[in-house]
């Protein structure tokens, strides 16, 4: 279970109306359900129930995106339509280049994601919890343009930080 280094870039409107960027670093873990690969894309928040739909006509995004799923407490969904692994597979089928699960409220999901799968996904499946999950969800909940870059080694530290 290697550490996943996640850089999140938020594109927000500045007072002048143009875009300005804010970068946040956080860490998670690569699960055995997916590959230990780097990935980058725009964040798309997905509700766990939204992944239940098996509608072939549903929009398949035409670009690489990173799905972010906040898992609920198991008692709130005692008979889930899909396992956590099934949800990851469904997201990748829809075009996700990576999936990040917030497992803070469902820590049992970690074991489910790390059960040795004979057919692991070819894209990374990362889980985050605690303070890192809070940081991620605070950005995602803004519903602004945000991108995530997932790496399996720490990002190179720039000597200076610039804005637009």
């Amino acid at each position: 279970k290697e550490t996943a280094f996640v850089e999140v870039v938020l594109f927000e409107s500045s007072p002048s109306g143009d875009y300005t960027t804010y970068t946040t670093g956080l860490t998670g873990r690569f699960s055995r359900a997916g590959a230990t690969l780097s990935a980058e894309g725009e964040i798309v928040q997905m509700h766990p129930l939204g992944l239940c739909n098996n509608n072939d006509e549903e929009d398949l995004y035409e670009y690489g995106w990173v799905g972010v799923v906040k898992l609920e407490q198991p008692e709130l969904d005692p008979k889930p339509c899909l396992t956590v692994l099934g949800k990851a597979k469904r997201a990748v089928q829809r075009g996700a280049t990576a999936v990040i699960f917030d497992v803070s409220e469902n820590p049992e999901a970690i074991d489910q994601l790390n059960q040795g799968s004979e057919d692991p996904l070819k894209r990374p499946v990362v889980y985050v919890k605690g303070a890192d999950a809070i940081k991620l969800m605070n950005i995602v909940n803004k519903q602004k343009v945000a991108r995530a870059r997932i790496q399996h080694r720490p990002p190179r530290q720039p000597t200076e930080y610039f804005d637009m």
Partner: nanobody, 121 residues
Framework: QVQLQESGGGLVQAGGSLRLSCAAS????????MGWYRQAPGKERELVAG???????NYADSVKGRFTISRDNAKNTVYLQMNSLKPEDTAVYYC???????????????WGQGTQVTVSS
């Protein structure tokens, strides 16, 4: 490197409409946001509208409700539908691709050549 080709500018009467198009070619995997900026004579270049790959949009207050930005990711093209045009919309309109350099932690833009939009009263 990214190349941007704009089209659709021209002369139109106040209250009229125009549709600008911009096709991106080259390394477009980094086209995180595609947008339109404008520069009127003697003024600074300003953002008109932007759209992300996931179609999250951002508009300047002065064009909200009149202009609509859209994007075709498959064709790497961005459009700006401009309705109810006013003389103050007269400017050179530039297409831009906004990307992000993770190594330097700095965003950067690629620019088109610009297309003139003139709104007469």
């Amino acid at each position: 490197q990214v190349q941007l080709q704009e089209s659709g500018g021209g002369l139109v009467q106040a209250g009229g409409s125009l549709r600008l198009s911009c096709a991106a070619s080259g390394t477009i995997s980094y086209a995180h946001i595609m947008g339109w900026y404008r520069q009127a004579p003697g003024k600074e270049r300003e953002l008109v509208a932007g759209i992300s790959q996931g179609s999250i949009t951002n508009y300047a207050d002065s064009v909200k409700g009149r202009f609509t930005i859209s994007r075709d990711n498959a064709k790497n093209t961005v459009y700006l539908q401009m309705n109810s045009l006013k003389p103050e919309d007269t400017a050179v309109y530039y297409c831009a691709v906004i990307s992000y350099d993770y190594i330097k932690s700095v965003p950067f833009r690629y620019w088109g050549q610009g297309t003139q939009v003139t709104v007469s009263s």
